[in-house]
Interface confidence: low
């Protein structure tokens, strides 16, 4: 089936670019992990078998290319064990301060909303402002979703200027553009520090027994979204005879409709993004995307959120990431003590 083989090609491309050697091996050597992946990806039996064979070959290629993958994982784990306690206390402090800031906003002006915050360098397609991009960068090169890049700070500054300008002129000392800006930027920097060290091998140090469930279902959800995007591309009436590749931009007119899931994948939130630039945004990217503003036309039609709520959301998202990292830290520590 040509449709099926095109999907397999796309899936292999995804695995090559987005999934570490260690995670691919985990998926292929653990039956439970594989079954979880197949279920999450909603793959028919024949496609699952075909993909399995293709991944078998890919795994061998990846190992030949990256003979030191295991040693690298150990190096990252050691670094994380050493550095995490400091990062944790700094992040906790930032989260506390963000919450205090949110409480202050609420008291001063309960009805204030965030308006016109969408900054070109940070928005994905139709107006989602994605503030924190750590977790994307390690998996994409030169793509439109590599947010932690030179110029990102400018985008955040622009966004926060929007928040702190005309729509909330409280004249209160505690609420300043600098404060909000500094807090979020500092939090980003802490997580960025982890991201920069781990580089493309972030998932090497996340391959811990406790994460297998989320890891496999995370990859599965992205493959499912990719498969559906592919299927929907095929059904577009004016699709070119040569069949557009998934690696080409999907336009808003393409009719792509992806099912909403509990943890929205970037694939599900974007219409104007290259699929090759879309990193897996499910669990195993612990340094996941934190959304400052849900101003998306196709996720929250016309919704305008209160500033305080949005700041709380940032704090909550940061806290969730911190909790996951903290859990990994505990697992790694226990391993070390054996």
């Amino acid at each position: 089936d040509p449709e099926s083989s095109i999907f397999i090609e796309d899936a292999i491309k995804y695995f090559k670019e987005k999934v570490s050697t260690q995670n691919l091996l985990l998926l292929l050597t653990d039956n439970e992990a594989w079954n979880g992946f197949v279920a999450a990806a909603e793959l028919p039996r024949n496609e699952a078998d075909e993909l399995r064979k293709a991944l078998d070959n890919l795994a061998r290629q990846m190992i030949m290319k990256d003979k030191n993958w295991h040693d690298k994982g150990q190096q990252y784990r050691n670094w994380f064990l050493k550095e995490f306690p400091r990062l944790k206390s700094e992040l906790e402090d930032n989260i506390r301060r963000l919450r205090a800031l949110a409480d202050g906003v609420q008291k001063v002006h309960k009805g204030t909303t965030i308006a016109n915050v969408v900054s070109g360098s940070l928005s994905i397609s139709s107006g989602i402002l994605t503030l924190v991009g750590m977790g994307l960068a390690p998996f994409t090169e030169g793509g439109s979703l590599v947010l932690l890049e030179p110029g990102m700070e400018l985008g955040i500054t622009a966004a926060l200027t929007g928040i702190t300008s005309s729509t909330m002129d409280y004249g209160k000392k505690w609420w300043t553009q600098a404060q909000a800006h500094d807090l979020v930027i500092k939090s980003l920097d802490k997580l960025k520090e982890v991201r920069e060290f781990l580089g493309e091998n972030i998932s090497n140090f996340l391959s811990l027994a406790g994460n297998t469930y989320q890891l496999t279902r995370g990859i599965g959800k992205d493959i499912r979204a990719l498969r559906r995007a592919r299927a929907n591309l095929q059904s577009v009436p004016h699709a070119s005879a040569s069949r557009p590749r998934v690696t080409e931009p999907i336009s808003a007119e393409s009719g792509e409709q992806v099912e909403r899931v509990n943890e929205p994948s970037i694939l599900e939130m974007s219409r104007g993004v290259k699929l090759t630039d879309v990193a897996p945004v499910s669990f195993f990217l612990v340094l996941d995307v934190v959304y400052l503003v849900y101003e998306s036309k196709h996720l929250h039609e016309g919704a305008k959120s209160e500033t305080a709520e949005e700041l709380k959301k940032v704090a909550q998202e940061l806290e969730e990431k911190l909790n996951i990292l903290n859990n990994n830290y505990k697992i790694l520590q226990a391993d070390q003590e054996l």
Partner: antibody
Framework: CQSLEESGGRLVTPGTPLTLTCTVS????????MGWVRQAPGKGLEWIGI?????STHYASWAKGRFTISKTSTTVDLKITSPTTEDTATYFC?????????????????WGQGTLVTVSS | AIEMTQTASPVSAAVGGTVTINCQAS??????LAWYQQKPGQRPKLLIY???TLESGVPSRFKGSGSGTEYTLTISDLECDDAATYYC?????????????FGGGTEVVVK
């Protein structure tokens, strides 16, 4: 210092289930695959099976149903469900190299001293 | 099921000489092959894995080669201490059933 020590080997009568235990020291069993290999007196090495770091098991075709491998955080067990006289051998527990997987191949670079199982009526 | 077949024992050579031991898998094992040395009353020792990679601490006199179904262990500049039984082992488990991952063993006698 990393080490493996097998225990539980003894004289048993045919049909009496026997569990051999490999106690590991200084080894994180969630990072390494572990295998069981046996050697009958004067014969060659015979692979029984392995348990991967994630806990999945692979057995030699002749060993399926006759042996069960399981693990805790510090031990790896080999249960001989219904021993016969042909199961008389020294049983070795072995740890796979770091990074050993189904794709890189499982290679054993650390071995226990072995424990002798004698099955006789 | 995958079967491993080794050169018949014994193989003998003089000190300073070279011995070659062959190992054949009944189907491709994708270079997932190891060689072990075992002396009487001792546990096996890993020499080579991945068909040709030398385990740390093993002298470079030991050389592994081969791919697919055919593999070779070559011991050059033989020493008395090399007298032992050598086993090949398929590290490729899964997909195909395996009767015994180990070959039958080849005894090397150093004269």
């Amino acid at each position: 210092c990393q080490s493996l020590e097998e225990s539980g080997g003894r004289l048993v009568t045919p049909g009496t289930p026997l569990t051999l235990t490999c106690t590991v020291s200084g080894i994180d069993l969630s990072s390494y695959a572990m295998g069981w290999v046996r050697q009958a007196p004067g014969k060659g090495l015979e692979w029984i099976g392995i348990i991967s770091s994630s806990g999945s098991t692979h057995y030699a075709s002749w060993a399926k149903g006759r042996f069960t491998i399981s693990k805790t955080s510090t031990t790896v067990d080999l249960k001989i469900t219904s021993p016969t006289t042909e199961d008389t051998a020294t049983y070795f527990c072995a740890r796979a190299r770091a990074g050993s997987t189904y794709y890189t191949g499982y290679y054993f670079n650390l071995w226990g001293q072995g424990t002798l199982v004698t099955v006789s009526s | 099921a995958i079967e491993m077949t080794q050169t018949a024992s014994p193989v003998s050579a003089a000190v300073g000489g070279t011995v070659t031991i062959n190992c054949q898998a009944s189907e491709s094992i994708y270079s997932n092959l190891a060689w072990y040395q075992q002396k009487p009353g001792q546990r096996p020792k890993l020499l080579i894995y991945g068909a040709s990679t030398l385990e740390s601490g093993v002298p470079s006199r030991f050389k592994g080669s081969g791919s697919g179904t055919e593999y070779t262990l070559t011991i050059s500049d033989l020493e008395c201490d090399d007298a032992a039984t050598y086993y090949c082992q398929s590290g490729y488990y899964g997909i195909s059933a395996i009767n015994n991952a180990f070959g039958g063993g080849t005894e090397v006698v150093v004269k």
